[in-house]
């Protein structure tokens, strides 16, 4: 094949190398940039700066090496348009600090930098924990300082990723009412900081205000739906990225659901009960208080995470005619109480017929298509066994 | 102990180039950045730039950029700084200054050169 | 260029006073590092990574500070204190220095 007089030529069939000496000053416009998986980048002194738009439609780009360049500095977000990115070696330029932000959302397998006047500072913390852990390759590289020593050696001390911390209201937050959060970010360097406000949807009115290092948020107009959901406050520095989050609990009062009993492996009347905060419970029997044992009990089911409500059951270990009745959930917070009442009938009484009829003496056999080795009662089939004192 | 011994003091005229010698010992002298720090009379410290005799890596202060020139002979443990094109305001006391990585900071000072710079 | 700004610029004191110097830097630093220099001499290491005593440095010698305020203080000044005291960075490239602080005898 002739020699290739272009600046980039073909490498392999998703490859391309550029190692015609002082050729680029970008990366903008390489040919059959969409396909690439690999790009070897050498001799461009005039390559300077790597930015977000030069990567650009290098979406299946998995191996870049830019090598005894000139390049001097490479943007946070350049490696946006390449996540599958792998192997990134950028030996032999002229940087003197690669941003964490740089590499994040990457998993690089390789990271290579050695033979860059790099500076230390703390905005290299993340390549010196890189080093200390062996991620990359970075540890058999040796990185030095310029002018300093072995990354290894620089002092981390200070190297902090912002502290935050949240102000919250400590009066109680009622349905409507407007909420003031503040979050207090300290630390060095300072680059930005924000909050992050996905789960909220429609819980309250949002407007933000204010700036490092004090950053306001007001939810003006809250609902009960705020309850659970994450308020984030984040901040970076040259460091990293630090999130605190908070909940407001806003107070409303207590309501319950109760549903048709169910047979599972033990009964359960199935119920819901919300509020805030959350509300205490009490069940009825036929008017009476219902003294829980080991044979009936509450049992709640997994909290989701992002809700007040509560679901659950009553649960009725084997009950029997004498557990049929009138089941009533009694719900209270301080801001109200709510009850809910459902007729349950577990088992006919047995002593409620006609003696014309005549008393059934045989046991069901084993339903084969029960999940557990027990009997399976059969309504109308079920033996009862009737014990006459005497005396 | 570690020791910097630097080259006696030089009177030069403008235009005219100075090279002053920095002799190491105590340590390995190709494990540790050496630097050149200058004071003008009645003044303040000035940074004007650092070698690594490992590999004769080098970077500059921007103001020093192309009228200086550093290097090192590794058999003798000797550092060096050529400052060409000289000034009046040239005149200084030159420190070279080992950069300790281990506590991160300048450790040891040469005892300095004098260099005027006089018509 | 990271600026270092000193102060005072001078200052009298006597022996046995308690003498603080502090620097501020144009921007946020990791350390700051200290240095005593007396006349015809080579700067002399007081204090490196902020706090820490250099070699055969008297405890009367303290530092502190984070981010861009740093202070120096000598709880007891003694007579071979009389000096000039400048401080430096390297947090940033390059490293930059005080204009220094020249402690006098009133």
């Known amino acids: 094949a002739a020699p290739c007089p272009d600046a980039c030529c073909p490498h392999g069939s998703s490859g391309l190398r550029c190692t015609r000496d002082g050729a680029l000053d970008s990366l903008h416009h390489l040919p059959g940039a969409e396909n690439l998986t690999e790009l070897y980048i050498e001799n461009q002194q005039h390559l300077q700066h790597l930015e977000l738009r030069d990567l650009r439609g290098l979406g299946e780009l998995r191996n870049l090496t830019i090598v005894k360049s000139g390049l001097r500095f490479v943007a946070p977000d350049a490696f946006h348009f390449t996540p599958r990115l792998s192997r990134l070696n950028l030996s032999f330029n002229a940087l003197e600090s690669l941003s964490w932000k740089t590499v994040q959302g990457l998993s690089l397998q390789e990271l290579v930098l050695s033979g860059n006047p790099l500076h230390c500072s703390c905005a290299l913390r993340w390549l010196q924990r890189w080093e200390e852990e062996g991620l990359g390759g970075v540890p058999e590289q040796k990185l030095q300082c310029h002018g300093q020593g072995p990354l290894a050696h620089m002092p981390n001390a200070s190297c902090g990723v912002p502290t935050l911390k949240v102000q919250v209201p400590n009066a109680s937050v009622d349905v409507g009412d407007d909420v003031l959060l503040r979050c207090q970010v300290e630390g060095r360097g300072l680059e930005q900081a924000g909050w992050i406000l996905t789960e909220l949807e429609q819980s309250a009115t949002v407007m933000k205000s204010g700036g490092l290092p004090s950053l306001g948020l007001t939810l003006a107009n809250v609902t009960s739906d705020l309850n659970r959901k994450n308020v984030t406050c984040w901040a970076e520095n040259d460091v990293g990225r630090a999130e605190v989050s908070v909940q407001v609990n806003v107070s409303f009062p207590a309501s319950v659901q109760l549903h048709t009993a169910v047979e599972m492996h033990h009964w359960c009347i199935p119920f819901s009960v919300d509020g805030q905060p959350a509300p205490s419970l009490r069940w009825l029997f036929n008017g009476s208080v219902l003294n829980e044992t080991s044979f009936i009990f509450t049992e709640f089911l997994e909290p989701a995470a992002n809700e007040t409500v509560r679901h659950g059951c009553l649960r009725l270990n084997q009950p029997t005619h004498v557990n049929n009745g009138n089941y009533t959930l009694l719900a209270a917070n301080p801001f109200g109480q709510a009850s809910a009442s459902i007729m349950a009938a577990f088992m006919d009484n047995p002593f409620e017929f006609n003696p014309e009829d005549p008393i059934p003496v045989s046991f069901s056999p084993v339903d084969t298509n029960s999940t557990s080795g027990d009997p399976v009662e059969k309504k109308d089939e079920t033996p009862f066994g009737v014990s006459v004192a005497v005396g | 102990q570690v020791q910097l011994v630097q080259s006696g003091a030089e009177v030069k005229k403008p235009g005219a180039s100075v090279k002053v010698s920095c002799k190491a010992s105590?340590?390995?002298?190709?494990?540790?950045?050496m630097h050149w720090v200058r004071q003008a009379p009645g003044q303040g410290l000035e940074w004007i730039g650092t070698i690594y005799p490992g590999n004769s890596d080098s970077s500059f202060a921007q103001k020093f950029q192309g009228r200086v020139t550093l290097t090192r002979d590794t058999s003798t443990s000797t550092a060096y700084m050529e400052l060409s094109s000289l000034r009046s305001e040239d005149t200084a006391v030159y420190y070279c200054?080992?950069?300790?990585?281990?506590?991160?900071?300048?450790?040891?000072w040469g005892q300095g050169t004098t260099v005027t710079v006089s018509s | 260029d990271i600026q270092m700004t000193q102060s005072p610029s001078s200052l009298s004191a006597s022996v046995g006073d308690r003498v603080t110097i502090t620097c501020r830097a144009s921007s946020s630093i990791s350390y700051l590092y200290w240095f005593q220099q007396k006349p015809g001499k080579a700067p002399k290491p007081l204090i490196y990574?902020?706090?820490s005593l250099g070699s055969g440095v008297p405890s009367r010698f303290s530092g502190s500070g984070s981010g861009t305020d740093y202070t120096l203080t000598i709880s007891s000044l003694q007579p071979e204190d009389f000096a000039t005291y400048y401080c430096q960075q390297y947090h940033s490239y390059p490293p930059t220095f005080g204009g220094g602080t020249k402690v006098e005898i009133k």
């Open positions: 200054t080992r950069f300790y990585y281990e506590d991160w900071y300048f450790d040891v």
């Open positions: 990574r902020t706090s």
């Open positions: 105590g340590y390995t002298f190709t494990e540790y950045w």
